[in-house]
């Protein structure tokens, strides 16, 4: 049994880091493998992660962490029974994938303005709380070409757009994702999408 693709890990910079790797053949990850991880810190204890299958030869493990500090470094040991298959290390702050924003809501009752709001996925005491920026994706269910991205570079989790920038009388969907420039993170997954019917009063044409 050998590791074909070494584990790569990403952290949500809060409580979970996810590591994925591939074996050289079909593997029952949860019964055959264990991933041990330990914070490099005096008296810290080793923890064991039981991996799950992720395709025939792929494995994925969700490492639980109390919290993350940017200087943290973890040792990782991948075991198959008594055999050490791979040894490495992981610095969560250098491989951050933020949590996806939640509670995306479209408020359509503001005069001809669409207000989209969502929740910051981090608590106020987390470093990323004040460092997230967002991308909002709005698309038409009827017209695949009607697809747009709005970059929200301020901290407030909201976006205002004029309803008239979208077509009237049809349904739209929106979703939002996040990233943090300070840690050069990857983008988060998209939030669940929300749907609304766009309608607004056309201004009277002047002849």
């Amino acid at each position: 049994m050998k590791v074909l693709q070494e584990p790569t890990c990403v952290s949500d910079y809060m409580s979970i880091s996810t590591c994925e790797w591939k074996m050289n053949g079909p593997t029952n990850c949860s019964t055959e493998l264990r991933l041990l991880y330990q914070l490099v810190f005096l008296l810290s204890e080793a923890h064991t992660c039981i991996p799950e299958n992720n395709g025939g030869a792929g494995c994925v493990c969700h490492l639980l962490m109390d919290d993350v500090v940017s200087a943290d470094n973890y040792t990782l040991d991948l075991w198959a029974g008594q055999q050490l298959l791979w040894k490495g290390s992981f610095k969560p702050s250098e491989h951050v994938k933020p949590r996806a924003p939640g509670n995306l809501t479209v408020h359509t009752n503001v005069s001809d303005t669409l207000l989209l709001t969502w929740s910051n996925p981090y608590p106020p005491d987390n470093y990323l709380y004040n460092h997230l920026t967002y991308a909002v994706n709005i698309w038409s269910e009827n017209d695949p070409a009607d697809f747009r991205i709005y970059n929200v570079t301020y901290l407030e989790p909201s976006l205002r757009i004029a309803a008239s920038t979208l077509k009237s009388g049809i349904s739209y969907r929106a979703r939002v994702r996040a990233w943090a420039q300070c840690y050069n993170t990857t983008w988060s997954e998209w939030s669940p999408s929300t749907k609304w019917h766009n309608s607004y009063r056309e201004p009277f044409e002047q002849h």
């Epitope: 914070l39 490099v40 810190f41 005096l42 008296l43 810290s44 109390d66 919290d67 500090v69 940017s70 200087a71 943290d72 470094n73 610095k91 702050s93 250098e94 470093y127 300070c182 840690y183």
Partner: antibody, heavy 120, light 110 residues
């Protein structure tokens, strides 16, 4: 209210041993590490070692290995430090201080200190 | 082992002015922004008191005139405006496999 109550001052002869205590109250004893720090008169702070009361695991500053022994009694929420083969260099104030892994070892509550004087 | 050098060794600052204390590590103690650096204040006859943990986080009950910053090998404690009760010796601390304290900076208020 969190308190770390240390045992009183001691005067000991060179070559002897001393065991001092640090009784914790106002929090769950096993949730925090206990650290011991030495301070000679007018000098900086010198970390001696750390013990995890939950499992008794210890970590020592290399220069105090063989000099200091850290133990705990969970039933009385008390940490102990024994110093052996005492010399005048061991005359100092010794502090116990708790710390939390989440804070990466920052010591947020300290005992009042135990003064040790080594003299013949 | 990491050695922490504090400067200056002593400092005289006028009431209401800014006090800046530096702590330099012999090698980098952080990866990207924050290291395991903590700051303490000690008054004569008393145990040290935690002021700032993890470089820049203010300990509960510590006035907002205290602030910490830095990364890599250089860390700073700022006190502004300085008050009379701030006269004390200040220590930085680094923790990883070992716990190390700086030599201390004695702050006097005039």
């Amino acid at each position: 209210e969190v308190q770390l109550q240390q045992s009183g001052p001691v005067l000991v002869k060179p070559g002897a041993s001393v065991k001092m205590s640090c009784k914790a109250s106002g929090y769950t004893f096993t949730d925090y590490y206990m650290n011991w720090v030495k301070q000679r008169h007018g000098k900086s702070l010198d970390w001696i070692g750390t013990i995890n009361p939950y499992n008794g695991g210890t970590g020592y500053n290399q220069k105090f290995k063989g000099k200091a022994t850290l133990t705990v009694d969970k039933s009385s929420s008390t940490a102990y430090m024994e110093l052996n083969s005492l010399t005048s260099e061991d005359s100092a104030v010794y502090f116990c201080a708790r710390s939390l892994l989440r804070r990466r070892g920052a010591m947020d509550y300290w005992g009042q200190g135990t003064s040790v004087t080594v003299s013949s | 082992d990491i050695v922490l050098t504090q400067s200056p060794a002593s400092l005289v600052v006028s009431l209401g002015q800014r006090a800046t204390i530096s702590c330099r590590a012999s090698k980098s103690v952080s990866t990207s922004g924050y290291g395991y650096i903590h700051w303490y204040r000690q008054k004569p006859g008393q145990p040290p008191k935690l002021l700032i943990y993890l470089v820049s986080n203010l300990e509960s009950g510590v006035p907002a005139r205290f602030s910490g910053s830095g990364s890599g090998t250089d860390f700073t404690l700022n006190i502004h405006p300085v008050e009379e009760e701030d006269a004390a010796t200040y220590y930085c601390q680094h923790i990883r496999e070992l716990y190390t304290f700086g030599g201390g900076t004695k702050l006097e208020i005039k």
